[in-house]
């Protein structure tokens, strides 16, 4: 476990940007930032979840543009943006920073939000390292920021996977000097394979060397791609500014341990020397005689270093070496917020009040005891009951995030933008309101007809 920290230093027009602020003089505004972390270095869809976490800054100071003045850097919110992560720090990640403007005028619809800039960077970063600085351009804007990942005790290490505990304080007897200052003593971490990279490798079992994403080889010293351009191909990359040598899956020789690389359509194949195997020859020749199967797993094959072994795992364990305990609770078998208990030989669900059954599937209460999450309201009818969920939530108890724009909430042709706190409607000309509900001049030509022919006031009118 640990925290990713982001410090925004400045946000304003970049060199050669607009001479006057593109912030537009619509009255008082303030900035805020959203940070989103995704694991890995792949180009993920913009709407894919922030699997490593997300955070929202406070609002910055109110800012009113002077129409003719050159645009300065805009006033920023105070403090760090912090994204806690629960599991190991992956080492490679995608960082997305969005700069939002909140207009504070007494304009129709209350505060209006608009996305000013969005930058996406794919980075490698070890936890516990120093602050890394960056400058990014997005259109006419320039964003300067620093970031780091740090572990939270008792976790330590570049991936926050080693656990530490404070050494117990010895008590001083009467008349004795104060004891030596408290020191930190780490639980003996697993002894990794000799030579395993301290920077790019880690182990959870003795004798192993597991690599952070982007590194390979038996000792995690071989980058998956030797290009600093993170796999981008072509004459040059506008995002990194670096030149990538010609295309080809064997560039930089991805085969470790002296393996030779041959190209296949759209991929590559490694021919490994004796004693190594795996996609990139990264696995050393372990045999069943080495006892590679943990937790009582049965080893089959692998009589000599040239042949692979297979571990047949006992119930409750998985992984190529039976090293992982199956977390049967991760499938969330207990319904209605029940607490899952994996007893090893069986699963138990401890149900919330008002629910019963092996998986808490029976609802004993009506709306009187029913909780609809996230602002949902309970609706009774015909002996049954259900949750009517607030915008942006769905599911039986309104616990599931729904696409807030799926219900087409913006009226009169307004455009819907999904937003961290719900949605934002950008209204068509002539309409106002949080959901564009109000035609400014319902009888004018700019709006849809307020009362189509044949309808009297008080009659309904439908809009697509």
């Amino acid at each position: 476990a640990g925290v990713f920290e982001l410090q925004i230093h400045s946000f304003g027009p970049g060199p050669g940007g607009a001479p006057r602020s593109p912030y537009s003089a619509r009255g008082p505004c303030r900035l805020f930032f959203r940070v989103c972390l995704k694991p890995g270095l792949s180009e993920e869809a913009a709407e894919s979840p922030c699997a490593l976490g997300a955070a929202l800054s406070a609002r910055g100071p109110v800012y009113t543009e002077q129409p003719e003045a050159p645009a300065p850097d805009l006033p920023l919110p105070n403090g760090l943006l912090q994204v806690p992560f629960r599991d190991a720090w992956p080492g490679t990640f995608s960082l997305i920073i969005e700069t939002w403007r909140e207009e504070l005028g007494d304009q129709i619809g209350g505060p209006a939000w608009s996305l000013l800039a969005r930058v996406t960077r794919r980075r490698r970063l070890a936890a516990g390292g120093p602050w890394a600085g960056d400058i990014q351009r997005a259109g006419a804007w320039e964003l300067r920021f620093s970031y780091r990942a740090r572990c939270e005790l008792p976790a330590v290490g570049t991936a926050c996977t080693r656990l530490c505990r404070p050494r117990s304080a010895s008590r001083c007897g009467p008349g004795l000097r104060p004891c030596a200052p408290l020191e930190d003593e780490c639980e003996a971490p697993p002894v990794c394979r000799a030579g395993c990279s301290l920077e790019h490798g880690f182990c959870e079992q003795p004798g192993e060397c597991r690599c952070l994403e982007g590194w390979t080889g038996p000792l995690c010293m071989v980058p998956v791609s030797t290009s600093s351009c993170l796999g981008l191909r072509g004459p040059s990359s506008t995002t990194t500014g670096c030149l990538v040598p010609g295309p080809g899956p064997c560039d930089g020789n991805p085969c470790a341990n002296g393996g030779s690389c041959s190209e296949t359509p759209g991929s590559f194949e490694c021919t490994c020397p004796r004693g190594f195997y795996g996609l990139r020859c990264e696995v050393s020749g372990v045999t069943c005689a080495d006892g590679p199967c943990f937790n009582g797993g049965l080893c089959v094959g692998g009589a000599d270093p040239d042949s692979a072994y297979i571990c047949h795992c006992p119930p409750g364990f998985q992984g190529s070496n039976c090293e992982k305990r199956v977390d049967r609770c991760s499938l969330q078998p207990c319904r209605n917020g029940g607490l899952c208990l994996d007893l090893g030989h069986a699963l138990r669900c401890r149900c919330r009040a008002g629910f019963a059954g092996p998986r808490c599937e029976h609802d004993l209460n009506d709306c009187a005891g029913r909780a609809c999450a996230n602002g949902g309201t309970c609706v009774e009818g015909g002996g049954a009951h259900r949750c009517s969920c607030a915008l942006g939530f769905g599911g039986r108890d309104c616990r599931e995030r729904a696409d807030p724009c799926a219900a087409r909430p913006c009226a009169h042709g307004g455009r819907c933008y999904a937003h961290f706190s719900g949605l934002v409607c950008a209204c068509a000309p002539g309409y106002m309101g949080a959901r564009c509900e109000f035609p400014v001049h319902p009888d004018g030509v700019s709006a849809l007809p307020a009362a189509p022919p044949g309808l009297r006031p008080g009659d309904p009118q439908r809009y697509p």
Epitope: G110, R408, A434, R435, E437, R462
Partner: nanobody, 119 residues
């Protein structure tokens, strides 16, 4: 089907106050908005104030600081408190109700109530 009934209009002197009320009967939805519009003699109907289902409010520049819109969800009602009335506020005031049901939007208008500001 939703019907809107306005009340509270009348004659008032400049500088005086009035409160307009509008009740929606029928089957109002939880995702809705209420508004007040007015049509002055010889002019087209214009938005005065509106309140969305999330409680956010909108006002036209000409009434900001003088008029206040509010709603009572339990009573399916919306109110317009009008202070510091001026002669140019004389108009027929219409209640407006907008709702979204299953992705289909519908709007409703009341019959209007006359507000006359005159000494």
């Amino acid at each position: 089907e939703v019907q809107l009934v306005e009340s509270g209009g009348g004659l008032v002197q400049p500088g005086g106050s009035l409160t307009l009320s509008c009740v929606a009967s029928g089957s109002p939805s939880s995702i809705n908005a209420y508004g007040w519009y007015r049509r002055a003699p010889g002019k087209q109907r214009e938005l005065v104030a509106g309140i969305s289902s999330d409680g956010s409010k909108v006002y036209s520049d000409s009434v900001k600081g003088r008029f206040t819109i509010s709603r009572d969800n339990a009573k399916n009602s919306v109110y317009l408190q009008m202070n510091s009335l001026r002669a140019e506020d004389t108009a027929v005031y219409y209640c407006y109700y907008f709702r979204t049901v299953s992705g289909s939007s519908m709007s409703y208008w009341g019959q209007g109530t006359l507000v006359t500001v005159s000494s």
